[in-house]
Every structure is written in C-alpha cells, then in structure tokens.
C-alpha cells in the first residue's frame, strides 16, 4: 500500500493530527522534499551574517 504521506509535495508536511492531510509548512519553516512528516526550521542569519536568500516554503535561507 502506498504511504498517503508520499502525496504531500515540498512546502508541506504530512499532518498526523489532521488525519495525514498535507498541511502548509508553518511560519519560519520549510520542507525541501515531498512526503515529509515535519517541516524544518528556517536558518537565522545572525551577527555578521546577512540574509542572501530568504527562507521559502521549500528552501532554507542562505546567509
């Protein structure tokens, strides 16, 4: 049987609290691949590091 979570695209996570429905990644998080059960926290560019690329729903920030 196919894992229902495999249908969740990048930018979402498979939400067990919502009956394995695909949910958008919450603020300050992302998922770069499909089928993820959690979204990763976005990198914070701090101190002398400046943000070269903002975190999106599918990719981490670049400092």
């Amino acid at each position: 049987l196919q894992d229902p979570c495999s249908n969740c695209p990048a930018g979402t996570f498979c939400d067990n609290n919502r009956n394995q429905i695909c949910s958008p990644c919450p603020p300050n998080s992302f998922s770069s691949a499909g089928g993820q059960r959690t979204c990763d926290i976005c990198r914070q560019c701090k101190g002398v590091f400046r943000t070269r690329k903002e975190c999106s729903s599918t990719s981490n920030a670049e400092c």
Epitope: P9, A10, G11, T12, D15, N17, R18, C22, S23, P24, P26, P27, N28, S29, E54, C55, S56, S57, T58
Partner: antibody, heavy 120, light 111 residues
C-alpha cells in the same frame, strides 16, 4: 462569538512607523495563526505576513521583509503589526485575519480593518 | 512576486451561472490544493467563500463552488443573485518566501 477587533485609524508622516493592534476573543488565541493583509484605496488585497501566536514565529512577504514586524501578547490575546519607514504607497486599510484551525489555506474571520494614511 | 491572474470583471443576469478564473503557476495554484476564494462588498472586510480549492465553510450558499485544473482555479456562482455583486479574490499558497498570494480581484456585476 469569534471577534477580531482592530485599533483605530492612524495618520502618519512619511518615514514614520505605525503599529496596528488586533485583539482576539471567542476562541483559543494560541491555536490559530494570524495573517495580516492590506488593501490600498481602490486596489486589491495584498498578503503581508503571518504569525504563530503560540510560539511567535513569523513569515513575511518578500516585499515587506525588513520593514514589517509582527508580534503578539498572549496575556491580552492581541497581535500587533508594525510597519516602519512609511511612504505614501503604504496608505491602505490593514486587516488582521484568523487562519483556519491550526494552519490552513484560508482565513475564516477578519478584523474590521484599520485605515492608515501616510501624508506629509 | 506578481499576483495571480484574474479577469477584471465578469457579469451575468439573475439566475445565470458565471465562472471566475484564477491562473497561477506550478509553484502556487498548480502545486498545492491550498486555494481560497473571498468575497468583498464595498467598505467591508473580505468573507471566506471557498477554501482548499473546493470546500465550502458552513453558512456559505451551495450556489458557490470551486474547482481546479492544472495551474488554474475557478469559482462558479450558480443562480446569480443581486447580493452576489461584489469583488472576488483568489488566494494561494506558494513556494516563494511570500507564502501566500492573492489574485488581482474580479468585479462581479449582476445585470
């Protein structure tokens, strides 16, 4: 009854900052995300950003990065949106809107809107 | 980040059906089933009519329905009524750092 009550109209000079509040009632404040959307006179809706009232994490529209700050006060169930370095193009009605349960693709309840006028 | 594309205006006679389109890309409308539609009367806050492409919140008339094909989402209003005259906006989740984006809006006129 779910309600989002926003602060009153503001008139600001270019270069100044404005802080709009949105007080929530009738639901568990920390269980629902809050979006901020603005609408310039005669124009369409523009998404500005979102805040998680539970942890305080935020995501801002690229256009407003560095100029907008969204915060919350869980003790008063209030969300704030501060926009700095105001210019005339920021003249608009600013709305807060409750994200549907937990985190979803829609906003089911909206505040009444706060008119912000930027004029010298 | 440009807005999703909607027709500026759509009109119809009472009782007719009309459809409003909302065209995006595979990075927003086409990539996710997170499309919403809002109705806005002049001077009022927007009201949610459709979410997750085709779901209707309680209290919204069954005359309103949503669908999606490829990169285009659609809102259909059947049995058009005078009170349906308003502006309608689509909204979609997107892969960009601007997490959500709106269409430019469509003015619906009941003739």
């Amino acid at each position: 009854e779910v309600q989002l009550v926003q602060s009153g109209a503001e008139v600001k000079k270019p270069g100044a900052s404005v802080k709009v509040s949105c007080k929530a009632s009738g639901y568990t404040f920390t269980s629902y995300y809050t979006h901020w959307v603005r609408q310039a006179p005669g124009q369409g809706l523009e998404w500005m950003g979102i805040i998680n009232p539970s942890g305080g994490s935020t995501s801002y529209a690229q256009k407003f990065q560095g100029r907008v700050t969204m915060t919350r006060d869980t003790s008063t169930s209030t969300v704030y949106m501060e926009l700095s370095s105001l210019r005339s193009e920021d003249t608009a009605v600013y709305y807060c809107a409750r994200g549907a349960p937990e985190y979803s693709s829609s906003s089911d309840y909206w505040g009444q809107g706060t008119m912000v006028t930027v004029s010298s | 980040q440009s807005a999703l594309t909607q027709p500026a205006s759509v009109s119809g006679s009472p009782g007719q059906s009309i459809t409003i389109s909302c065209t995006g890309t595979s990075s927003d409308v086409g990539g996710y089933n997170f499309v919403s539609w809002y109705q806005q009367h002049p001077g009022k806050a927007p009201k949610l009519m459709i979410y997750d492409v085709s779901k209707r919140p309680s209290g919204v008339s069954t005359r309103f329905s949503g669908s999606k094909s490829g990169n285009t989402a659609s809102l259909t209003i059947s049995g058009l009524q005078a009170e349906d005259e308003a502006d309608y906006y689509c909204n979609s989740y997107t892969t960009s750092s601007t997490r959500w984006m709106f269409g430019g809006g469509t003015k619906v006129t009941v003739l």
